[in-house]
């Protein structure tokens, strides 16, 4: 059974990760960012179902992509925090927060979506299981 | 004090042309995105399309894709939307919207023109 | 594209009365949600940001509540100036997408 404080630690890391997703959504969903109409013509795969921890597979396998499309928003006049480190940060949280004990075959929905569509909904994952676990 | 004003409305017959500006005063016009939004009589809003401070993206509603072409000149404060191919549907009042932040777009639109009717009959 | 709906689609009150409209999206929007409020023959007027947020100039009587797919607008005690319809609109992505709106009207 989970206990108070292991309770608490994966609280903290669903804080940490929903504010690192809010912060790519926000650093690309703006007035000044020049690459958006191209960076909405990449399609993301999202989850048939995200209900629980061991969902966030389905994340871990899109980072990848999520970094290069990231990558190609970079200019002058936009700038994520280097994305290489913010990806590796998430990537770490998602392995401790599904934990490697069972490998998950992650199941997709039919339809793809973009990266403002990807994000936000793992964003509402987050915010789903954070609440429950208030 | 911040103000923008459309122009360019009036009555036109289907398929044919109109260009509707809005000139803009009172804060840093080539710092915010602007929209178009339009609400057709004794009907809900609807919004029409965005551009970019500097024009680099532009977005519209399906509807207008191909036909509507929105487009800025920032040396003139200057918004404008060129309407082409129009339709009886798109009759409507037409107002340009300041953001109410350059760089978020939850701050929704906090200043709007008072509009500029357009009329689409044969 | 985002669906937004709003209930009720019109709503008779009194002066001091406290009213709340509901507005729904089709899919999560987070707090990307922003709401006006609209006269006759007048264009909208910027009432609450980010689904909580005051713009500033307007009474402490308004406020915006929730997250992801569900939201409120409350307006605590109904004043005569009040009387208006009201419309919710997310700003996650484009196209941006409008409620039908909300008539607010004298009982």
């Known amino acids: 059974a989970p206990t108070s404080s292991s309770t608490k630690k994966t609280q903290l890391q669903l804080e940490h990760l929903l504010l690192d997703l809010q912060m790519i959504l926000n650093g690309i969903n703006n007035y000044k960012n020049p690459k958006l109409t191209r960076m909405l013509t990449f399609k993301f795969y999202m989850p048939k179902k995200a209900t629980e921890l061991r969902h966030l597979q389905c994340l871990e396998e899109e980072l990848k992509p999520l970094e290069e499309v990231l990558n190609l928003a970079q200019s002058k006049s936009f700038h994520l925090r280097d994305t290489k480190d913010l990806i590796s940060n998430i990537n770490v949280i998602v392995l401790e927060l599904k934990g490697s004990e069972t490998t998950l075959m992650c199941e997709y929905a039919d339809e793809t979506a973009t990266i403002v569509e990807f994000l936000n909904r793992w964003i509402t994952f987050c915010q789903s299981i954070i609440s429950t676990l208030t | 004090q911040v103000q923008l004003v459309e122009s360019g409305g009036g009555v036109v017959q289907p398929g044919r042309s109109l260009r509707l500006s809005c000139a803009a005063s009172g804060f840093t016009f080539s710092s915010y995105g602007m929209h178009w939004v339009r609400q057709a009589p004794g009907k809900g809003l609807e919004w029409v399309a965005v551009?970019?401070?500097?024009?680099?993206?532009?977005f519209y509603v399906d509807s207008v894709k191909g036909r509507f072409t929105i487009s800025r000149d920032n040396s003139k404060n200057t918004l404008y939307l060129q309407m082409n191919s129009l339709r009886a549907e798109d009759t409507a009042v037409y107002y340009c919207?300041?953001?109410?932040?350059?760089?978020?777009?939850?701050?929704?639109?906090?200043?709007w023109g008072q509009g500029t009717t357009v009329t689409v009959s044969s | 594209d985002i669906q937004m709906t709003q209930s009720p689609s019109s709503v008779s009150a009194s002066v001091g009365d406290r009213v709340t409209i509901t507005c729904r999206a089709s899919q999560g929007i987070s707090n990307w949600l922003v709401w006006y409020q609209q006269k006759p023959g007048k264009p909208p007027k910027l009432l609450i940001y980010?689904?909580?947020s005051l713009q500033n100039g307007v009474p402490s009587r308004f406020s915006g509540s929730g997250s992801g797919t569900d939201f409120t607008l409350t307006i605590s005690s109904l004043q005569t100036e009040d009387f208006a319809t009201y419309y919710c609109q997310q700003a996650l992505s484009f196209p941006w997408t409008f409620g039908p709106g909300t008539k607010v009207e004298v009982k």
């Open positions: 551009i970019w401070y500097d024009g680099s993206n532009k």
């Open positions: 980010a689904a909580s």
């Open positions: 919207a300041r953001p109410g932040s350059d760089y978020y777009f939850y701050y929704g639109m906090d200043v």
